[in-house]
């Protein structure tokens, strides 16, 4: 078993990207607040091409995307489901 699988013990994202990931290729987004041994917010995106990447939580495009997805989820099924994982 790889160390990377013990995700409750430390940060999962050793590096992040700030480049834009298009909404059309996003399958799932997970926002994890600080906690469980990781002092920072982590944003993980799963793409439709079977990749999983860490994204800079402060990237402006991500903030816009999260607002867009959350506003859509109020009226319909979101294109990219957002899960907020509690770090308790």
């Amino acid at each position: 078993i790889l160390e990377a699988h013990y995700t409750n013990l430390k940060c999962r994202c050793s590096g992040v990207i700030s480049t834009v990931v298009g909404l059309n290729i996003i399958d799932r987004i997970q926002v994890t607040p600080p906690g469980n041994g990781c002092p920072k917010t982590e944003v993980v995106i799963w793409t439709k091409m079977k990749k999983v990447i860490c994204v800079n939580p402060r990237a402006k495009w991500l903030q816009r995307l999260l607002r867009h997805v959350q506003s859509k989820s109020l009226s319909s099924t979101p294109q990219a489901p957002v899960s907020k994982r509690r770090a308790a």
């Epitope: 990377a4 994202c13 590096g15 091409m49 990749k51 999983v52």
Partner: antibody, heavy 122, light 107 residues
């Protein structure tokens, strides 16, 4: 505990179809993010990626073999399959199946089967 | 397709030696590179993931690094149990591609 095991014919003749089965436990191909890949290794040589199949039935193939490869799965039986048509001597190799899980950090092929030696000979 | 050029193809070193194996990527792969160790008669197993992260249970004498398109696996002080084949794998994009492998032998 994750385990994988390959099965299939040990020997077959040129132009025949090779059918391999990967039986696994410790994970399910119905779970989001789970995948199984096939990799082969001719004796004394390097590894060659062949194909991947994912929980949602998304499939990826090595372009150099795409016309001869078919990957599939039986989720309820915890099995993945690979078919290679029209085999020839260069297909002689040890064939491995390996698990991938879309977690972060993403480490494809984190668990491997023991491999099965396949010989193509007339 | 992304080509991974691995060198050397074989390497003979003495116990305690520092050895380095290199893979060069033909296109940008970022940090999406794994090093696998394959002991004789066994299946491959990841030792380094994301270019420089040590997999669980792997001794700290193993390390990974990157300089541009060159990716290196270093063993700081060779031990007998390190005798194995080593393979790099890029998974930046499909098709995934492996290096040709390096056979590490103990003198």
């Amino acid at each position: 505990q994750v385990t994988l095991k390959e099965s299939g014919p040990g020997i077959l003749q040129p132009s025949q179809t090779l059918s391999l089965t990967c039986s696994f436990s410790g994970f399910s191909l119905s779970t989001y993010g789970m995948g199984v890949g096939w990799i082969r290794q001719p004796s004394g040589k390097g590894l060659e990626w062949l194909a991947n199949i994912w929980w949602d039935d998304d499939k990826y193939y090595n372009p150099s073999l795409i016309n001869r490869l078919t990957i599939s799965k039986n989720t309820s039986n915890n099995q993945a399959f690979l078919k290679i048509t029209n085999v020839d001597a260069p297909d002689t190799a040890t064939y491995y199946c390996a698990r991938s899980e879309l977690v972060m950090p993403y480490v494809p092929f984190d668990f491997w089967g023991q491999g099965i030696m396949v010989t193509v000979s007339s | 397709d992304i080509q991974m050029t691995q060198s050397p193809s074989s390497l003979s070193a003495s116990l305690g030696d520092r050895i380095t194996i290199t893979c060069q990527a033909s296109q940008d792969i970022g940090i999406d590179l794994i090093w696998f160790q394959q002991k004789p008669g066994k299946s491959p197993w990841p030792v380094i993931y994301y270019t420089a992260n040590l997999a669980s249970g792997v001794p700290s004498r193993f390390s990974g690094s990157r300089s541009g398109s060159h990716y290196s696996l270093t063993i700081s002080s060779l031990e007998s149990e390190d005798m194995a084949d080593y393979h790099c794998l890029q998974y930046k994009q499909y098709p995934f591609t492996f290096g040709s492998g390096t056979k590490l032998e103990i003198k």
